[in-house]
């Protein structure tokens, strides 16, 4: 599907001192979506402001979000889902900035859960797998996912691939023997809806085998 | 009150090209994307691609690649619509037209008719 | 490409009648409640103008004799009591896949 900013990509910063981000949640809680927005300037004193929405919502013209502690948010079966909202940051009734955006446009999955990874030593493969919450959801029911792995000594040196579904193999002969592997993953929108990457999930930590010296393969642990 | 003025009628000979116009007015030209709908002469409509002002960023019909180029002026609130070796079966009227969300279009230009005639 | 088809090609009805135009869709263009399915009128010389969005929302400005309805691959256009200034072709669109498609129109006349 054609789009216009790249998936991940946060609206523009506005030009001025209140510029926000946003992202959007659907049925994040039973048949409730949620909106989150936020200052991008930690600095900002947010002590008087508030947040509006208006536009493409069933039944009311507009909504006030809730403030908890920095960030700002919405619980509520009432968004349209098509049509640009008007999201701005007041002071009592006067408007200091606002943006028009398509609430299907910055959706934020949910992150992935329960991955694991499982040695097949017969097959000298790695199995691994994970669930998400979006396999019984209505909307965003298609992602991808970004699995990354690295040898637990190698600070930054990530591997990622990206997968469809929830199952992803690993050679043996990929990974360095009788080594310990963090693995995590995290997910993106990716039919219709755009957005950005879900938070990662908890890690997941593996050893591979020794290598056996008489058949030069890795023993199991 | 919102708006979409497109330049005038065209004709120009196969093998040109012919650049359309259309400016925006009465709202924040950076809020919506803006796209382009040809009509052939007693035909229906088509969709040829649009563009997002905020960012320059393109989307085209599979159809018009390579034929179209989209392309927007934030200071003057217009967006052009480029199309390159013309020939007889590009005559039509050509509409810009605002998205009001993902992709419906609730403002249309008047129409540009291009007429492509050796 | 979601092929569009529109049915009837054209429509002649009385003055205070009811006019059902539908559209069928080669493959659903609904996402749960979601129906990415929109109606245009044109008349003679003009630019389409949009009357519903999402399937069953009015756009602002339209008399509310117009309606949609429908889910997935089949919906309905319905001009409850047809007036003489609702003479137009009508389209429908789809916005779930690029590209955006568009029915083959449907022709309101007065009988």
């Known amino acids: 599907e054609s789009g216009y900013a790249q998936n991940g990509d946060l609206e523009d910063a506005e030009l001025d001192d209140y510029s926000f981000s946003c992202y959007s949640q659907l049925e994040v809680n039973g048949s409730q979506h949620s909106l989150t927005c936020a200052f991008e300037d930690p600095d900002v004193n947010i002590t008087n402001l508030e947040f509006e929405i208006c536009g493409a919502l069933v039944e009311v013209k507009c909504l006030n979000f809730r403030k908890l502690q920095e960030i700002y948010f919405i619980e509520t079966k009432k968004f349209l889902l098509i049509g640009k909202s008007n999201i701005c940051v007041k002071v009592g009734e006067k408007s200091l900035t606002c943006k028009k955006i398509d609430l299907t446009t910055i959706v934020k999955p949910e992150a992935p859960f329960d991955l694991s990874v499982v040695y097949r030593e017969g097959a000298n493969d790695f199995v691994v797998t994970f669930n998400t919450s979006h396999l019984q959801k209505k909307y965003v029911k298609v992602l991808m996912h970004d699995v990354a792995y690295r040898q637990e000594k190698d600070e930054n040196k990530w591997t990622h691939v990206n997968l469809s579904s929830t199952k992803l193999t690993l050679l043996q002969r990929k990974l360095q023997p009788a080594a310990m592997y963090e693995i995590k993953v995290r997910s993106i929108p990716d039919h219709y809806f755009k957005g950005f990457w879900s938070e990662w999930s908890p890690s997941y930590y593996f050893r591979t085998p020794e290598i056996n010296n008489s058949s030069g393969e890795m023993d199991p642990i | 009150q919102v708006q979409l003025v497109q330049s005038g009628a065209e004709v120009k000979k196969p093998g040109a090209s012919v650049k359309v116009s259309c400016k925006a007015s009465g709202y924040r030209f950076t809020d919506y994307e803006l796209h382009w709908v040809r009509q052939a002469p007693g035909q229906g409509l088509e969709w040829m691609g649009g563009i997002d002002p905020k960012t320059g960023g393109t989307a085209y019909n599979q159809k018009f690649k390579g034929k179209v180029t989209l392309t927007s002026d934030r200071s003057t609130s217009t967006v052009y619509m480029e199309l390159s070796s013309l020939r007889s079966e590009d005559t039509a009227v050509y509409y810009c037209?605002?998205?009001?969300?993902?992709?419906?279009?609730?403002?249309w230009g008047q129409g540009t008719t291009v007429t492509v005639s050796s | 490409d979601i092929v569009m088809t529109q049915s009837p090609d054209s429509l002649a009805v009385s003055l205070g009648e009811r006019a059902t135009i539908n559209c069928r869709t080669s493959?659903?263009?609904?996402?749960?409640?979601?129906?990415?399915m929109h109606w245009y009128q044109q008349k003679p010389g003009q630019p389409p103008k949009l009357l519903i969005y999402g399937a069953s929302n009015l756009e602002s400005g339209v008399p509310d004799r117009f309606s949609g309805s429908g889910s997935g691959t089949d919906f309905t256009l319905t001009i409850s009591s047809l007036q003489a200034e609702d003479v137009a072709v009508y389209y429908c669109?789809?916005?779930?896949?690029?590209?955006?498609?568009f029915g083959g129109g449907t022709k309101v006349e007065i009988k």
């Open positions: 669109q789809q916005s779930i896949k690029d590209p955006y498609t």
């Open positions: 493959e659903s263009v609904s996402i749960h409640l979601l129906h990415l």
């Open positions: 037209a605002r998205s009001g969300g993902r992709w419906y279009f609730d403002v």
